[in-house]
């Protein structure tokens, strides 16, 4: 019993005095608490409290299920307790067969003993299998058997307490352990597309993955800026224990201009928290917006490829593509593809392939697209770069020694005499009139030039050379003529090509 | 022995919030779990969460997160449940019982009416 | 979520009775199904649990049996006072789930 100094409060005394009591089922229980200040007795196994407001406690036919702690309080808040094992051999446990695990945390089965004598208190699993390997436990008589330190892995494992009672194995009645998870990491979200792209009126429709080892992950979608909570429909699964996955559907049946916008998948637990964004962008009408790849004005010499390639952002998807030239369509050549095989691409390429071009094939090439909603075109400038071609070369009659040339660039012409019977024309001769004649052909073909030169300026016998040229070549015709007296023979026009 | 008595009946005005309140005596309270279920006007038994007071954190029915909070007061053995954003269809007699699982124990019931 | 699908939604029996009324699991819950007793204005009351362990100081005419997807509760003989609705709820995975309870009543 307690002991205390003079003067100062002291705790209760009890009668047995002794920390322990055995007695038999059937015999009587009969504890005396004394202190002038006393209040009550207190009784406390498992799940049951009782209060006593006599000093005496009296239990005339003890049963297995007055074992347990018997408290008794004075006024000062001072205790003393006394514990009560009732012998019963055909109930060696008291039982509460509810028992959760926190995993990681220690446990109790609660399986208190009522008699204190029996030998290897422990526990066993159910229908004689084992426990798992590495599940550890302390026994104690009266309050029952913690298991240390619980795993996931003991979730619905079936348990018995035991004793040996002259030689033989008692269980108790079972016990299923139901493991509740720790968090220890954030919940993984995903979303089923980054964005979306929607006509007015058109459903928006979008879920959000959510998945964590409990149904007790939070999770929520939010529009970011608001606190308006949005219409949500939920499927869940459980793959197993501790595998929960969570569908949060978010639906806007009939999607407007200012529905667009960002929106989020958040979810948390007790560990931390993780989102995931959509973004919706919904417009009153279709577009298509073309975004040519190359210049629009395209120059290319006579016999090379070139490509005309654009790329074009189109919703609701394109329905018809085609490329024009001259009022007529291309049926090959040309190929157009989605940029990306994803499924929310809005943006495609086009390419027409022209080959081995020629002076001729100048001129306006026209991509053409459409939609539900609206077409859109995009127009290429091709000029061909040709060597210029000397088309005529003659002497009027006024005497004028002329020279027709067409090619693109604008080919320039320039005129040279060479004396006797010389090869090198160097010395040059001004013309006297240069004309740009308009083409009869397409706008985008070659252009021509005539240039001429007096002829009665030259005095002696010789070659003269008209020489026309631009970036992409030359090309020269020759006039020879020879004097008899003061006159001139005939003049032999021929021309040479020049690389 | 084990005996749960739960706060009296409300009346809410739509929007708002409610808090039932569910004591528990003649048993030990934090070792047990102690959930709440509803029962809406001659329908069945929906399970809203519970709480295992000792381990602090509560599970609930993704139907009513966000919206409900349970928690439990140790020191007076006392588990609360708080419904928030009240609708019309939130009247209900809403019950305590004991457990997570199944439940062994219930209160008498606490009749929530929401009614603008 | 699980669901549980109960059967018949309601029945008329006399006192003296032998009762069965079944509730199906919408996937596997081993044996994690408990049966509740509920009379008018009063709280439920649990009967079963584990599917087939009676609740201490419930009476014998009242058996469970199954495992899996498949219960039934029996009350082996009605007495006056069993008139009532009778839920199943399954607590294999939270969230628990109820069936939508069968009603029994005095013919």
């Known amino acids: 019993q307690p002991s205390v100094s003079p003067g100062e409060p002291s705790p209760p005394s009890i009668h047995p005095g002794k920390s322990d009591l055995i007695v038999r089922v059937g015999d009587e229980i009969r504890l005396l608490c004394t202190d002038p200040g006393f209040v009550k007795w207190t009784f406390e196994i498992l799940d049951e409290t009782n209060e006593n407001k006599q000093n005496e406690w009296i239990t005339e036919k003890a049963e297995a299920t007055n074992t347990g702690k018997y408290t008794c309080t004075n006024k000062h808040g001072l205790s003393n307790s006394i514990y009560v094992f009732v012998r019963d051999p055909a109930k060696l446990f008291l039982v509460d067969r509810s028992l959760y695990g926190k995993e990681d945390n220690d446990t109790l089965v609660r399986c208190p003993l009522t008699d204190p004598e029996v030998t290897n208190y422990s526990l066993k699993g159910c229908q004689g299998k084992p426990l798992p390997k590495d599940l550890r436990f302390i026994p104690d008589p009266k309050a029952g058997i913690m298991i240390k330190s619980v795993k996931r892995a003991y979730h619905r494992l079936c348990l018995h307490c035991s004793v040996d009672q002259e030689g033989k194995s008692v269980l108790s009645e079972k016990f299923i352990l139901k493991v509740r998870p720790a968090f220890k990491a954030v919940p993984v979200v995903s979303v089923s597309k980054a964005s979306y792209l929607l006509r007015e009126g058109e459903e928006f429709t979008v879920t959000c993955t959510i998945k964590d080892v409990s149904s007790s992950v939070y999770s929520t979608w939010k529009r970011e800026n608001s606190q308006t909570k949005l219409q949500e429909k939920y499927n869940s699964w459980h793959h197993g224990d501790f595998n929960y996955e969570r569908q949060a559907t978010l639906t806007i049946s009939s999607a407007r201009v200012n529905d667009s916008g960002v929106f989020m998948c958040y979810a948390n637990n007790t560990f931390g928290s993780a989102n995931v964004t959509t973004t919706l962008e919904v417009v009153d009408k279709g577009f298509i917006n073309i975004f040519p790849m190359i210049n629009t004005t395209v120059f290319v010499n006579d016999g090379e490829n070139v490509d005309l390639i654009v790329e074009y952002e189109a919703f609701p998807k394109p329905e018809h593509q085609q490329w024009i030239y001259m009022n007529r369509t291309f049926t090959d050549k040309w190929e157009d593809y989605p940029k990306s095989e994803n499924e929310s691409n809005i943006r495609y390429v086009s390419e027409l392939h022209l080959t081995r071009l020629k002076g001729t094939e100048g001129g306006t090439y026209t991509f053409l697209v459409s939609n539900s909603d609206v077409n859109a075109a995009i127009a290429f400038n091709v000029y061909v770069n040709t060597k210029p071609e000397i088309l005529t070369y003659d002497r009027l009659v006024n005497g004028m020694l002329q020279c027709v040339a067409a090619g693109f660039p604008e080919p320039t012409i320039d005129w040279y005499f060479c004396p006797g019977t010389e090869q090198r024309c160097s010395a040059s001769v001004l013309p006297v009139d240069v004309q740009t004649l308009n083409s009869s052909g397409p706008p985008f073909g070659k252009l021509v030039v005539q240039s001429s030169i007096d002829s009665s300026a030259f005095k002696h016998n010789g070659t003269v050379e008209c020489k026309a040229y631009n970036d992409v070549g030359k090309t020269s015709a020759y006039f020879n003529f020879a004097f008899k007296g003061n006159n001139k023979e005939q003049i032999h026009p021929h021309t040479l090509f020049t690389p | 022995q084990v005996q749960l008595v739960q706060s009296g009946a409300e009346v809410k005005k739509p929007g708002s919030s409610v808090k039932v309140s569910c004591k528990a005596s003649g048993g030990t309270f934090s070792s047990h779990a102690l959930s709440w279920v509803r029962q809406a006007p001659g329908q069945g038994l929906e399970w809203m969460g519970g709480?295992?007071?000792?381990?602090?954190?509560?599970d609930y029915a993704q139907k009513f997160q966000g919206r409900v909070t349970i928690t439990a007061d140790e020191s007076t053995s006392t588990a609360y449940m708080e419904l928030s954003s009240l609708r019309s269809e939130d009247t209900a007699v809403y019950y305590c019982?004991?457990?997570?699982?199944?439940?062994?124990?219930w209160g008498q019931g606490t009749l929530v009416t929401v009614s603008s | 979520d699980i669901q549980m699908t109960q059967s018949p939604s309601s029945l008329s029996a006399s006192v003296g009775d032998r009762v069965t009324i079944t509730c199906r699991a919408s996937q596997d819950i081993s044996q994690d199904l408990a049966w509740y007793q509920q009379k008018p204005g009063k709280a439920p009351k649990l009967l079963i649990y584990d599917a087939s362990s009676l609740q201490s100081g419930v009476p014998s005419r009242f058996s469970g049996s199954g495992s899996g997807t498949d219960f039934t509760l029996t009350i082996s003989s009605l007495q006056p006072e069993d008139f009532a609705v009778y839920y199943c709820q399954q607590y294999y995975y939270l969230p628990s789930t109820f069936g939508q309870g069968t009603k029994v009543e005095i013919k």
């Open positions: 709480i295992i007071p000792s381990f602090g954190t509560a």
């Open positions: 019982a004991r457990g997570l699982y199944d439940f062994d124990y």
